[in-house]
Interface confidence: low
């Protein structure tokens, strides 16, 4: 004996991608000699049975037989979403609804508020925007493998009344560390599947100089010919060295060449040298004894720096 | 119309843990967002977490963060929020909420129906 409940149609909420094809599958046991039919929610009838309805070369049939109506809905669009109800004709009729959740797909976020010729321990302040999400997407900040606590996202309803815009800002004091990173901003939504949807802005932070005296061979020996590289890194790179010799007053002033050249290695060569790299961005001094031996393997000499 | 019951509140120590329930009724439950506010006493109501329909997505205050989780199982139509390391500073009426429509939302305007409030007490 059939029960009542064997003549209800039964289907199943669904969500699908704007843009992609969404399956509406609706059944019943007992079909009591009725057709099943689909409707939008606008209540249009889509297909009754196998029997198109509407006119909308996006709807097809994809099964049709007693017990079941299945059709699919390709294309979709966010104006789709809704209650599509299955109906079965019987004394009295039953339907059954089927809500379909369309997400909307967020647009690559854009990145805005950089402003050059940040300096070191300045404060930067970069906004994010991605539209078009359905539900309201989430945005995240990173620095390289760093996670960065970006304002909580904000979250504003787009013109067509659907879909949202959201936004959020994040505020950072920079290090030398920082010069050449990139901050990116990650859009996270349901709808990309995992897919990673970010925009990076490659960040210039200027600094003072540093530098390192670098001897050449790093063991000389009386004779030898050597050179003494200042090495200088900053942003933007020194582009002025000016080498003394101390002890002397005031110190002897050598030349402005990153490299200090010795063609034949003297005794009276021996002394602390100091090397002063400049850039717009300020100065630093490093130092190098210099003790220059016998020729003899033995190697003696040391280097200090500030 | 959707209803939200609570469950779950109670006294508890510092550094002690608790869950929240708030088991809703109406069918299209799972097609909509879901938070947890709470209220503590003279001050006003503050947003703690947030989930998507889909529990893919979820939001969390500051002061929830590391320490809270919020999950649904939509076949119960149940939210919940799991709280470890509790603070005397969470001491507070705690509210689950649902919008009227799937917006999710991180501010209680966003939300149309609340719970009854179940209050938590973390104290020595």
């Known amino acids: 004996n059939l029960s009542q409940d064997d003549s209800q149609p039964w289907t199943s909420d669904e969500t699908v991608v704007a843009g992609g094809t969404v399956v509406l599958k609706c059944q019943v046991k007992d079909h009591e000699d009725s057709s099943l039919q689909w409707s939008n929610p606008a209540q249009q009838t889509l297909y009754f049975g196998e029997k198109r309805a509407l006119r909308d070369n996006r709807i097809q049939l994809v099964t049709s037989t007693p017990h079941e109506l299945s059709i699919s809905i390709s294309n979709v669009a966010l104006a789709d979403e809704g209650e599509y109800t299955c109906s079965i004709f019987t004394m009295p009729v039953r339907t059954a609804k089927s809500l379909v959740t369309v997400l909307g797909i967020p647009q690559k976020p854009i990145i805005t508020g950089y402003k050059s010729s940040l300096r070191e321990k300045d404060t930067a302040t970069l906004n994010c925007q991605s539209s078009g999400s359905k539900p309201a997407a989430r945005l995240t900040w990173r620095k390289g493998d760093q996670e960065l606590h970006g304002e909580p996202t904000r979250i504003q309803e787009d013109p067509n009344g659907k879909t949202f815009t959201v936004s959020s800002s994040v505020t950072f004091q920079v290090t030398r560390e920082d010069d050449g990173a990139s901050i990116v901003c990650s859009v996270n939504h349901e709808s990309l599947k995992g897919a990673d949807r970010s925009t990076s802005q490659r960040i210039e932070v200027l600094y003072t100089p540093t530098a390192m005296i670098r001897p050449d061979p790093p063991h000389p020996r009386e004779g030898q010919k050597l050179l003494l590289h200042c090495e200088g890194r900053g942003n933007p790179v020194p582009q002025q060295y000016l080498w003394e010799k101390e002890g002397s007053v005031p110190p002897l002033k050598m030349t402005q060449e990153s490299a200090l050249i010795f063609p034949f290695l003297n005794k009276s060569d021996s002394g602390t040298y100091g090397c002063t790299a400049t850039s717009n961005m300020g100065s630093y001094k490093a130092y190098y004894t210099l003790n220059v031996n016998d020729p003899s393997p033995v190697p003696s000499s040391s280097s200090t720096y500030h | 119309q959707v209803q939200l019951v609570q469950s779950g509140g109670g006294l508890v120590q510092p550094g002690g843990s608790l869950r929240l329930s708030c088991a809703a009724s109406?069918?299209?439950?799972?097609?909509?967002?879901r938070g947890w506010f709470r209220q503590a006493p003279g001050k006003g109501r503050e947003f703690v977490a947030a989930?998507?329909?889909?529990?893919?997505?979820?939001n969390y205050a500051d002061s929830a963060k590391g320490r809270f989780t919020i999950s649904r199982d939509n076949s119960k139509n149940t939210l919940y929020l799991q709280m470890n390391s509790l603070r005397a500073e969470d001491t507070a009426v705690y509210y689950c909420?649902?919008?009227?429509?799937?917006?999710?939302?991180?501010?209680?305007?966003?939300?149309?129906?609340w719970g009854q409030g179940t209050l938590v007490t973390v104290s020595s």
């Open positions: 909420a649902a919008p009227a429509s799937r917006r999710p939302s991180w501010d209680a305007d966003g939300y149309d129906y």
């Open positions: 109406g069918r299209t439950f799972s097609n909509y967002a």
């Open positions: 989930i998507d329909y889909s529990g893919g997505s979820t």
